[in-house]
Interface confidence: medium
């Protein structure tokens, strides 16, 4: 039984050119984690597993950091990274959890951080 | 599944060299994290070094083998490779192979059967 819960950083906005980071975390449960991998709609960005560690996508190696965590940093932020995030946590013995997160990348200088929510 | 062999294991000397290679058959590197693991007598398996062809290349290692171990995949021959260098009586272990699923969607290792590493004079 999947007891666990995702919790994100939700809906996110920052500043073309700028970076941000994608935070996941899971609570409620005692599986261990034993990959997280982060996706942008159907394109894998990068993997962090337990033991292997961090393996980044070569599309996105200039403009995206491991960490801090569990997290991912996306740098030099452009319009077109625009879009829903997720990261799917790979758990034994509970299975996949994933959480969503979604990062509007505007042009002004006015860029908010949306609230936090949660995932069941 | 990806099937895994491993071979080059063998008896050598303290401060001597080996190399070992994990051939996969069912499956392409490039589709998989491709790791190795050491279980010595009496203790736990743990992580030696790992490879990411996906990634470009994407190296680590544990901070034990750090500068003495080289980890690199040939994707045309499908296999891994874990040069040992400068080792010790401490390196003796069963070496294995394993490929991590990476795919969206997926997780888990396939593990090869080891090949054993003795250092010893």
């Known amino acids: 039984m999947m007891t666990g819960t995702i919790e994100t950083t939700g809906n996110i906005s920052a500043e073309k050119g700028g970076s941000i980071i994608l935070q996941c975390h899971l609570s409620s449960t005692t599986a261990q984690v034993t990959q997280v991998n982060w996706e942008q709609q159907d394109q894998l960005l990068a993997i962090c597993n337990a033991d292997l560690g961090w393996h980044i996508s070569p599309s996105f190696k200039d403009r995206v950091a491991p960490g801090p965590g569990l997290g991912l940093t996306l740098q030099s932020l452009t319009v077109n990274d625009t879009g829903e995030y997720f990261c799917i946590y790979h758990t034994y013995p509970d299975g996949t959890y994933t959480g969503r997160i979604f990062l509007e990348v505007l042009e002004s200088s006015v860029a908010e951080h949306g609230a936090r929510f949660q995932i069941p | 599944e990806v099937q895994l062999v491993e071979s080059g294991g063998g008896l050598v000397q303290p401060g001597g060299s080996l190399r070992l290679s994990c051939a996969a058959s069912?499956?392409?590197?490039?589709?998989?994290?491709m790791g190795w693991f050491r279980q010595a007598p009496g203790k736990e398996r743990e992580f030696v070094a790992a490879?990411?062809?996906?990634?470009?290349?994407?190296?680590n290692y544990a901070d034990s083998v750090k500068g003495r171990f080289t980890i690199s995949a040939d994707n045309s021959k499908n296999t891994a490779y874990l040069q040992m260098n400068s080792l010790k009586p401490e390196d003796t272990a069963v070496y294995y192979c394993?490929?991590?699923?990476?795919?969206?969607?997926?997780?888990?290792?396939?593990w090869g059967q080891g090949t054993l590493v003795t250092v010893s004079s």
């Open positions: 069912g499956g392409t590197l490039s589709s998989y994290i």
């Open positions: 490879i990411s062809g996906w990634s470009g290349g994407t190296t």
């Open positions: 394993a490929a991590a699923r990476f795919a969206p969607g997926s997780r888990g290792y396939d």
